[in-house]
């Protein structure tokens, strides 16, 4: 059954997968989706990487983690409760039914109605779309329009925090890291 | 294999509009990555001028940003630039290049120069 | 916008010599960093990205190095067909190049 996660409306939510590389950059391709890991592939793809970088994204969906390093964990920013529902992380080992597959499921919860206000909260409404330890270059009209010029390497104590949160702990203690090579 | 080749003008009036575009073979843009303009002015540097994404997000070098459209044609697999009000500056060679969401460039086409002169 | 200041802007070198190339931002950048090979009339070359990944099929004698703001490329033992101008470009922000280094044959 599904590992649960949990957030709220107009939260950022993370979901973590992780692997270890075989050797440091001999990256695996990884694919996200919403909807449970198919035989193969992931469905409704959200974000997807190749053996160098992130080359299929959607507006919302980012890995603020160290994905060179096996961090392939998503960040969902500021969500509604339309996003709530199984997420497929599908690392996709080379070789015929090698792929490890594992199926997250995320409850939205309503958010609070006086809910205090928090540092994430504040970043991610003055910085929609930044939340990153990674450079993911700049701003996209669809989303944002225009965007000053930020350093997202300032911001990355709070990804860190982020990342570091207890459910990240969760899955590595169920023991959902694979280990590549 | 990824192919990209520019095509366009060579030469331009100034303040009239520079229009190129990029044919892609050998990857739909719909499928993924960045794609991008580039440009290289004689003799100088380059200079990213922006990207339209495969979801068909775009996002522009602020410098630019008032004169520069980016857009796809998907049915051609093809994506284009269009400069207005161009000057003498604005001669360069330009290049479109496939980027990853952390924009650098793994591919490129071969170049297109284009001459802003009256 | 992010500065990218490389030098040297031009060095002149011999087959075999090792070669290295500095580049510094204006503010820290990371390791989103990339280098580029470049040969008159020709469009530029992937070399190296993230700082220090070797983009496929670019010969090992090619490293890079660095975060924040200071990054390297080197050269360990340059070939003929290595004499080119190479840029180191930032991807924190929006993408921007160094001023490029030109290798000669001395």
């Known amino acids: 059954s599904e590992v649960e996660y949990r957030a709220e409306v107009g939260q950022n939510a993370y979901l973590p997968c992780f692997y270890t590389p075989a050797a440091p950059g001999n990256l695996v391709p990884v694919c996200w989706g919403k909807g449970a890991c198919p035989v193969f592939e992931c469905g409704n793809v959200v974000l997807r990487t190749d053996e160098r970088d992130v080359n299929y994204w959607t507006s919302r969906y980012w890995l603020n983690g160290d994905f060179r390093k096996g961090d392939v964990s998503l960040t969902i920013e500021n969500v509604t409760l339309a996003d709530s529902g199984i997420y497929c992380c599908r690392i996709q080992i080379p070789g015929i039914m090698n792929d490890e597959k594992f199926n997250l499921k995320l409850v939205i919860k309503p958010a609070k109605v006086t809910p205090a206000p928090t540092r994430q909260r504040d970043f991610t409404a003055a910085f929609p779309r930044m939340l990153t330890t990674r450079g993911h270059g700049p701003a996209e009209t669809q989303t944002l329009g225009s965007l000053p010029d930020i350093n997202l390497t300032q911001i990355s104590t709070l990804a860190n925090e982020l990342r570091d949160s207890r459910l990240a702990n969760d899955l590595r203690d169920s023991g959902a890291t694979i280990r590549i090579g | 294999q990824v192919q990209l080749q520019e095509s366009g003008p060579g030469l331009v009036k100034p303040s009239q509009t520079l229009s190129l575009t990029c044919t892609v073979s050998?990857?739909?843009?719909?499928?993924?990555?960045?794609w991008n303009w580039i440009r290289q002015p004689p003799g100088k540097g380059l200079e990213w001028m922006g990207y339209i994404s495969h979801s068909g997000s775009t996002s522009y070098n602020p410098s630019l940003k008032s004169r520069i459209t980016i857009s796809v044609d998907t049915s051609k697999n093809q994506f284009s630039l269009k400069l207005s009000s161009v000057t003498a500056a604005d001669t360069a060679v330009y290049y479109c290049a496939r980027g990853y969401r952390s924009p650098w460039f793994a591919y490129w086409g071969q170049g297109t120069t284009v001459t802003v002169s009256s | 916008d992010i500065q990218m200041t490389q030098s040297p802007s031009s060095l002149s070198a011999s087959v075999g010599d090792r070669v290295t190339i500095t580049c510094k931002a204006s503010?820290?950048?990371?390791?989103?960093v990339a280098w580029y090979q470049q040969k008159p009339g020709k469009a530029p070359k992937s070399l190296i990205y993230s700082a220090s990944y070797r983009y496929s099929g670019v010969p090992s004698r090619f490293s890079g190095s660095g975060s924040g703001t200071d990054f390297t490329l080197t050269i360990s033992s340059l070939q003929p067909e290595d004499f080119a101008t190479y840029y180191c470009q930032q991807y924190n922000s929006y993408p921007t190049f160094g001023g490029g280094t030109k290798v000669e044959i001395k």
């Open positions: 503010q820290n950048v990371g390791a989103n």
């Open positions: 050998g990857y739909s843009i719909t499928s993924g990555f960045a």
